[in-house]
Interface confidence: medium
């Protein structure tokens, strides 16, 4: 094959957005539409990702750069760079393969997504439970009986924690 | 579905030349490379060239630079490939194939082949 | 040109033995090789591209690795409808280069 060669690398003067074509006598070639490069001196342009059904468009694809999705209302992105969207559910759940189902006795979810966790055990720290645990939030452990000896002063449980964007009544 | 449909096979004395067609369907046939690879009797496969048929722009292999022509004619979606000078060791079954392209452009793969066109070189 | 080297050139398998092909390129092809069937009927399909990417179709037994210069076409499960010739091909440079082909019988 007959090809004009340089000292220097010709695809190292093809700028992001572009290709080095081999079937071309290695010019720069620009990326075709739906199609990018994000860095120079590139062999091939990559295909955009494409954000279809559970997936929604985050951020378009150029010809330097990929598209970015997320995940529609009632999903959130898992993996790296949202490679899979799971179903949410309520606090106080966790996903299973037969759907969301309540968090048991003992555990807790104060998320719309991952597993039900076992509440805190207090006993573990020398301490008591303070506020008892539910199904979305976590046993609150308080100071241990030793410390609430006669003549001590008594203790005043924290006030609950606000939910975010929850203005104070 | 992608299709490639080659000419039928040819007998040819040495010195002459011969042309085989690739009628494509079932796809964008201005939007993809078409290679022509050929395989001698008991033998490998030897890539000669291809053509984008969008603009008729070739490759050709260095050994077959001086006598073979690759062509389209977009009407038709069809490709030819003409060799001349025959000779005995250009016996072969010559295949066009189309190029896709997977996740990146710019890298080829020969995804779809034709039958095949048996070309026969004696005297 | 790019030299590509196959080996071995033939080999003889039960069906159900895990079958392994290996192409060897004369300079870095950085993972850009392919891997076509060619079956006695002389049609050819192509199974892998870009070093390890099945193409639609093509049975999951079928895999395929690598780096560099150094590359493997598996076949984890030897079927009866494998019996073919095996080729790698690199999709580095041009001009475009194969192996001399693997012809793989059944036992």
């Known amino acids: 094959f007959e090809r004009t060669r340089s000292l220097q690398d010709p695809c190292s003067n093809c700028p992001a957005g572009t290709f080095c074509d081999n079937n071309r006598n290695q010019i720069c070639s620009p990326c075709p539409p739906n199609s990018f490069s994000s860095a120079g001196g590139q062999r091939t342009c990559d295909i955009c990702r494409q954000c279809k059904g559970v997936f929604r468009t985050r951020k378009e694809c150029s010809s330097t750069s990929n598209a970015e999705c997320d995940c529609t209302p009632g999903f959130h992105c898992l993996g790296a760079g949202c490679s899979m969207c799971e179903q949410d559910c309520k606090q106080g759940q966790e996903l299973t393969k037969k759907g969301c189902k309540d968090c048991c006795f003992g555990t807790f979810n104060d998320q719309k997504r991952g597993i039900c966790r076992p509440w805190t055990n207090c006993s573990l720290d020398g301490k008591s439970v303070l506020v008892n645990g539910t199904k979305e939030r976590d046993v609150v452990c308080g100071p241990s009986p030793a410390d609430l000896s006669p003549g001590a002063s008594s203790v005043t449980p924290p006030a609950p924690a606000r939910e975010p964007g929850h203005s104070p009544q | 579905q992608v299709q490639l449909v080659q000419s039928g096979a040819e007998v040819k004395k040495p010195g002459a030349s011969v042309k085989v067609s690739c009628k494509a369907s079932g796809y964008t046939f201005t939007s993809y490379w078409i290679n022509w690879v050929r395989q001698a009797p008991g033998q490998g496969l030897e890539w000669m060239g291809n053509?984008?048929?969008?603009?008729?722009?070739?490759n050709y292999d260095q050994k077959f630079k001086d006598r073979v022509t690759m062509t389209r004619d977009t009407s038709t979606s069809t490709v030819y490939m003409e060799l001349s000078s025959l000779r005995s060791e250009d016996t072969a079954v010559y295949y066009c194939?189309?190029?896709?392209?997977?996740?990146?452009?710019?890298?080829?793969?020969?995804?779809?082949w034709g039958q095949g066109t048996t070309v026969t070189v004696s005297s | 040109d790019i030299q590509m080297t196959q080996s071995p050139s033939s080999l003889s398998a039960s069906v159900g033995d895990r079958v392994t092909i290996t192409c060897r390129a004369s300079q870095d092809i950085s993972n850009y090789l392919n891997w076509y069937q060619q079956k006695p009927d002389k049609t050819v399909k192509l199974l892998i591209y870009y070093t390890s990417r099945l193409h639609s179709g093509v049975p999951s037994r079928f895999s395929g690795s690598g780096s560099g210069t150094d590359y493997t076409l598996t076949i984890s499960s030897l079927q009866p409808e494998d019996i073919a010739t095996y080729f790698c091909?690199?999709?580095?440079?041009?001009?475009?280069?194969f192996g001399q082909g693997t012809k793989l019988e059944i036992k």
């Open positions: 091909q690199q999709g580095n440079t041009l001009p475009y280069t």
């Open positions: 194939t189309k190029s896709g392209e997977y996740g990146k452009i710019g890298y080829y793969a020969m995804d779809y």
């Open positions: 053509i984008y048929p969008s603009d008729s722009y070739t």
